[in-house]
């Protein structure tokens, strides 16, 4: 049976340093005797889930496996049960621990909401920012590019740090940092546009710390379906935060009569959330929920971690699939409102737009759809995966693949419907986006399954870097470029403005199909990569001398 005391201790937060030191002394003694990192006195991170007999280990998926035995000639762990009940060990009530972990996940999800709220508050008042600073479209593009590039560059750095240092401190510092920068940016004088550009870059760095590290803490707090659920909540923060960002931006601007105030809301909330993270999020050890020993911290070099990740086929293919999602969402988000406006011009239900913002109403509808489909997609994806896990071990990547391939069909239908029916186009957008967003949380879960805890932050960071680099960093520009290229070879008319953009956007469903293929490829290797990760986790639970990852 599983060592319940250990399981409870694993979920608990940090205790006083004295008790911690005492437990470490005990653990060293137990390890010397047993050759395994017994559960005795396990602190926040818990032990390896080893029972009194020292024969069972909770794996990455939460299942129970036979623990690797110690070196020949070493005795078992007869003193384990006794030690666990000794004066130094604390066994908090499991219920309170569940609440603590739930609260931690809620705070981390709230932080993610704020991350996106902050990002999209700027999007919500972008026209005002452009007007105030006299920013041209290329300048607005620069703001976006600087943000994405700094985010991309910073993500691997925080991945490295997140696997080696105190994650909640890095998280809080990241939130405090972007909050301070965003707040300061609301006071930038009109003549210093370059300072605004710099501030967006710095915010990108701050937000990269959060996006990279927070999911790994959730991964270390929960396992199996609970982890899927918690990651779903965490990733639902993306559409929720984005939608709230737009709303906050426009409503605060209207209430205060000045767009500058819109940039002062999220920093205040950010400071509060950063403080709550420091207080309420337990100092979880890597592999916490996977029942690994307290010594679990990245001992391998960053280069070695990268090599291991690149050799992990499930991780590589799921990352490429994520890039496809990112490509499509980036391009559609940028161009669909204008495309639908041009469709209405062709249908004679709207006038040609000579004075931007063009398609403002379409932007609003599209924003609302994106927000709702984000929620629906995350819920649908998580639900479908839970159900499919009863049928197959490859449920996670297969659900993603089906979602992607289904999404591609409906994205194609947008361009068919738009010629005659805007409502039809919106229905296709709704279904297409729901299916596209259904893999958000599942992709994160796939990563947690196939990557060992000491590499998760690096893995999340590299995946984030890849998805931006191959995805939304270039897709809006590529679509615009293709559209212009088509228009140059045709006559200048509203019909060709509409058609050229439509033909350019047809690249999206092809990329999404490619993403679906990548998920199918992930499904091929998922079971073996998951097993390998679990095997490595079990090895990590052994004394340092025998660890090889």
């Amino acid at each position: 049976m599983m060592c319940l005391e250990c399981a409870s201790a694993a979920a608990g937060g940090a205790e006083e340093e004295e008790a911690d030191a005492e437990r470490r002394r005990r653990r060293r003694g137990a390890q010397r005797g047993a050759g395994g990192s017994g559960c005795c006195g396990a602190r926040g991170a818990g032990g390896a889930g080893v029972s009194a007999a020292g024969d069972e280990v909770q794996t990455l998926s939460g299942s129970v496996r036979r623990a690797p035995t110690g070196p020949p000639g070493t005795p078992g762990t007869p003193g384990c049960a006794a030690t666990a009940k000794g004066p130094g060990a604390q066994q908090p009530k499991p219920a309170s621990l569940g609440r603590g972990r739930g609260a931690a996940a809620a705070i981390l999800s709230l932080g993610n909401v704020l991350n996106y709220l902050d990002r999209y508050t700027v999007a919500g008042v972008l026209l005002d920012i452009q007007q105030h600073f006299g920013v041209k479209d290329r300048g607005a593009g620069l703001l976006q590019s600087v943000f994405i590039c700094s985010f991309m560059v910073a993500a691997p750095i925080f991945g490295y740090l997140g696997d080696r240092f105190n994650r909640k401190v890095i998280l809080s510092c990241g939130i405090f940092f972007w909050s301070a920068v965003t707040f300061s940016s609301s006071f930038i004088p009109q003549q210093y546009f370059w300072l605004l550009v710099l501030s967006r870059g710095l915010v990108g760095i701050g937000e990269a710390s959060y996006s990279t590290i927070a999911p790994t803490i959730i991964g270390d707090l929960f396992t199996k379906n609970t982890r899927t659920l918690m990651l779903s909540v965490f990733y639902f923060a993306i559409p929720l935060g984005s939608g709230l960002g737009y709303i906050t931006g426009s409503s605060v601007k209207q209430a205060a009569g000045d767009w500058h105030w819109a940039l002062r809301v999220s920093p205040v909330l950010g400071m509060i959330t950063g403080t709550l993270i420091l207080i309420l999020v337990p100092a979880t050890k890597r592999g916490h929920a996977d029942q690994l020993g307290d010594q679990l911290k990245a001992r391998t070099s960053w280069l070695r971690d990268m090599k291991a990740l690149i050799r992990n086929r499930s991780y590589v293919f799921s990352s490429l699939a994520t890039s496809a999602v990112s490509f499509a969402t980036g391009a559609l988000g940028m161009w669909i409102p204008l495309y639908l406006h041009r469709a209405q011009v062709v249908q004679k239900t709207a006038e040609t737009c000579n004075s931007p913002p063009c398609g403002a109403k379409d932007s609003l509808i599209f924003g609302a759809i994106t927000c709702f489909t984000g929620f629906l997609g995350v819920v649908t994806g998580a639900g479908a995966t839970r159900w499919c896990r009863l049928k197959t071990q490859r449920a996670d990547p297969l659900v993603c693949a089906v979602g992607m391939l289904g999404s591609a069909i409906f994205i194609c239908l947008i361009f068919v419907a738009a010629k005659s029916s805007i409502v039809g186009a919106y229905i296709c957008i709704f279904v297409g986006e729901t299916l596209l967003f259904s893999n958000w949380a599942i992709t994160a879960d796939i990563l947690m399954y196939v990557v060992i805890p000491t590499r998760r932050a690096t893995a999340v960071a590299l995946q984030s870097f890849t998805s931006h680099l191959l995805g939304d960093a270039g897709s809006p520009y590529l679509i615009g470029f293709i559209s212009d290229l088509i228009r140059q070879s045709t006559k200048d008319s509203p019909l060709w403005e509409f058609l050229s953009l439509g033909y350019a956007l047809m690249l999206c469903p092809f990329v999404v199909v490619l993403g679906g293929m990548f998920f199918l490829a992930t499904a091929l290797f998922f079971v073996s990569d998951r097993a390998r990760a679990e095997q490595q986790v079990n090895q990590l639970a052994m004394p340092p001398a025998s660890v090889k990852v």
Partner: antibody, heavy 125, light 107 residues
């Protein structure tokens, strides 16, 4: 040397239309935002409106007093900016100046760094 | 719309004196204020941008200061060619607006 030359002014009756033209040289016109500013006889300066460049989709902004009656346009190939005035009123009588905004590639300023010599428009019956 | 109030409307000084011209905004506008000089029967010319940045070719006796709602154009030791009308202009918000002007005349 930067030069802005306005043409097309004159005496017109209330309710009629008039189109002013401003030809430019000495700077990268296609990248530069252009404004019209007017000055009634013996009075102060009043901004009429501005037109942005291609990279800002040729967006035009107007003062409330002329909105719906005046239209600013530009022709990058001819390096010209135009002010089309409809339904002219007595209070539109003024010297109209063509002005340029300093450009910084990614963004533009909202101050007027160069001014034309001005052209007189008189609205009277 | 942002209203700019210039004071005084007319300022009489003797050459060699130093003067300060005031411009007050109806709301905080950071440093988004610009100063122009308009000589009789001439087009205006830009003297100072963003409250304190002098334009090239402008004599060093012209300087600007201020932030928020109160701004000042200072002319150190006024010379004969400085007698003209001075306008402030805000660029914080559209529509762009000008002050009513301060006429600097010989005493």
């Amino acid at each position: 040397e930067v030069q802005l030359v306005e043409t097309g002014g004159g005496l017109v009756q209330p309710g009629s239309s008039l189109k002013l033209s401003c030809s430019t040289s000495g700077f990268t016109f296609s990248e530069t935002w252009m404004s019209w500013v007017r000055q009634a006889p013996g009075k102060g300066l009043e901004w009429v409106g501005l037109i942005k460049d291609k990279n800002s989709n040729y967006e035009a902004n107007y003062a409330e007093s002329v909105k719906g009656r005046f239209t600013i346009s530009r022709d990058d190939s001819k390096r010209r900016v135009y002010l089309q005035m409809y339904t002219l009123r007595d209070q539109d009588t003024a010297t109209y100046y063509c002005t340029s905004h300093e450009d910084f590639y990614y963004y533009s300023s909202y101050y007027f760094d160069y001014w034309g010599q001005g052209v007189m428009v008189t609205v009277s019956s | 719309d942002i209203v700019l109030t210039q004071s005084p409307a007319t300022l009489s000084v003797t050459p060699g004196e130093s003067v300060s011209l005031s411009c007050r905004a109806s709301q905080g506008i950071s440093t988004s204020i610009h100063w122009y000089q308009q000589k009789s029967n001439e087009s205006p010319r830009l003297l100072i941008k963003y409250a304190s940045q002098s334009m090239s070719g402008i004599p060093s006796r012209f300087s600007g200061s201020g932030s928020g709602t109160d701004f000042t154009l200072r002319i150190n030791r006024v010379e004969s060619e400085d007698f003209s009308v001075y306008y402030c202009q805000q660029s914080y918000n559209l529509p762009l607006t000008f002050g009513s002007g301060t006429k600097l005349e010989i005493k």
